[in-house]
Amino acid sequence: APVPPGEDSKDVAAPHRQPLTSSERIDKQIRYILDGISALRKETCNKSNMCESSKEALAENNLNLPKMAEKDGCFQSGFNEETCLVKIITGLLEFEVYLEYLQNRFESSEEQARAVQMSTKVLIQFLQKKAKNLDAITTPDPTTNASLLTKLQAQNQWLQDMTTHLILRSFKEFLQSSLRALRQM
């Protein structure tokens, strides 16, 4: 697994560097997660032909993965910092069950999958510190998550491969959109 943010050799070699600001720390954390996702996608794509599947076929899958929309206030047009931050945190919390599902889906990248999951938890904590309106953040229901996890794990092999691919792709897109939005804050 890659070295977590703040522990790379450059940081060790530069003790006199300015401490990271909150936004730089968040940026670094997201990029670390994105690197992890890239590695996981590489294994998924090497293992199956899901990555070549057409977008239309993928869209038919009924996974309810978090997605950014104009109303969430994260785009340049109609940007709203607080609404957007709530959307990002809520979306990440919703992704957690899917990241749990990924834990037993990788052979050579098992550590990487765990690193993505744990780093996402840390990212949520960073963002919660930044949010003013924590009451607006809805936490997913644990019972609903448990039954969703059971349902996903009961799928046949092809559907499990498809689900893995979709989760990784959607999570990557959500994080990249979050990065774009957070840079405006």
């Epitope: 730089e24 997201i30 990029r31 977008k55 950014m68 785009f75 990249q176 405006q184």
Partner: antibody, heavy 120, light 106 residues
């Protein structure tokens, strides 16, 4: 062959409109960041706008905000730049380019550019 | 928009010289910076991205460094093909460029 081809440039009067097209081949715009950059004669590069494939989210430079609109047609694998209320200072070669799907992104592919001249 | 200030605007140097171009951002941009080379009548081409990562196929005499607001592009030993205009570009918010540095033969 992987390439970008711009079209739609030309001479237009101040206050007029023009729509630039950028046809992509060899890759799909539906899964790539796209960007417009311009360069006035003898001047430097200026970022105009970009479009993130996810949900079609667009960003604009302050100098064009409210006048230019970037859009895409996935079925035609083409991105557009609709330019309204054109001014003399919009005269430039307009390049369509692709942000590499990296974090952070950078431009890994450029078109050859199309010249827009705003003059009466 | 984030302002990118490049210096110098023009740089006269000779083949074999070591040259450095500086780029300063009006706010912190982490390592969200790329360097491009442009020759007259041509589209630019990327040299360095992520502040210090060399693009595939670009000679190793080119190097980039910096983070936050201060960045540099260094050419360790100028070659005849290197006389061109160089631009930095941030991708932290939007994609503004520096005003360019024209590298000319002394």
């Amino acid at each position: 062959e992987v390439q970008l081809v711009e079209s739609g440039g030309g001479l237009v009067q101040p206050g007029g409109s023009l729509r630039l097209s950028c046809a992509a081949s060899g890759f799909t715009i539906s899964s790539n960041y796209m960007i417009w950059v311009r360069q006035a004669p003898g001047k430097g590069l200026e970022w105009v706008s970009d479009l993130y494939y996810y949900a079609g989210d667009t960003y604009y430079a302050d100098s064009v905000k409210g006048r230019f609109t970037m859009s895409r047609d996935i079925s035609k694998n083409t991105v557009y730049l609709q330019m309204n209320s054109l001014r003399a200072e919009d005269t430039a070669v307009y390049y369509c380019a692709r942000w590499a799907d990296d974090h952070p992104p950078y431009i890994d592919m450029w078109g050859r550019g199309t010249l827009v001249t705003v003059s009466s | 928009d984030i302002q990118m200030t490049q210096s110098p605007s023009t740089l006269s140097a000779s083949v074999g010289d070591r040259v450095t171009i500086t780029c300063r951002a009006s706010q912190g941009i982490s390592s969200w910076l790329a360097w491009y080379q442009q020759k007259p009548g041509k589209a630019p081409k990327v040299l360095i991205y992520k502040a210090s990562t060399l693009e595939s196929g670009v000679p190793s005499r080119f190097s980039g460094s910096g983070s936050g607001t201060e960045f540099t592009l260094t050419i360790s030993s100028l070659q005849p093909d290197d006389f061109a205009t160089y631009y930095c570009q941030q991708s932290w918010l939007g994609g503004s460029f520096g005003q360019g540095t024209k590298l000319e033969i002394k």
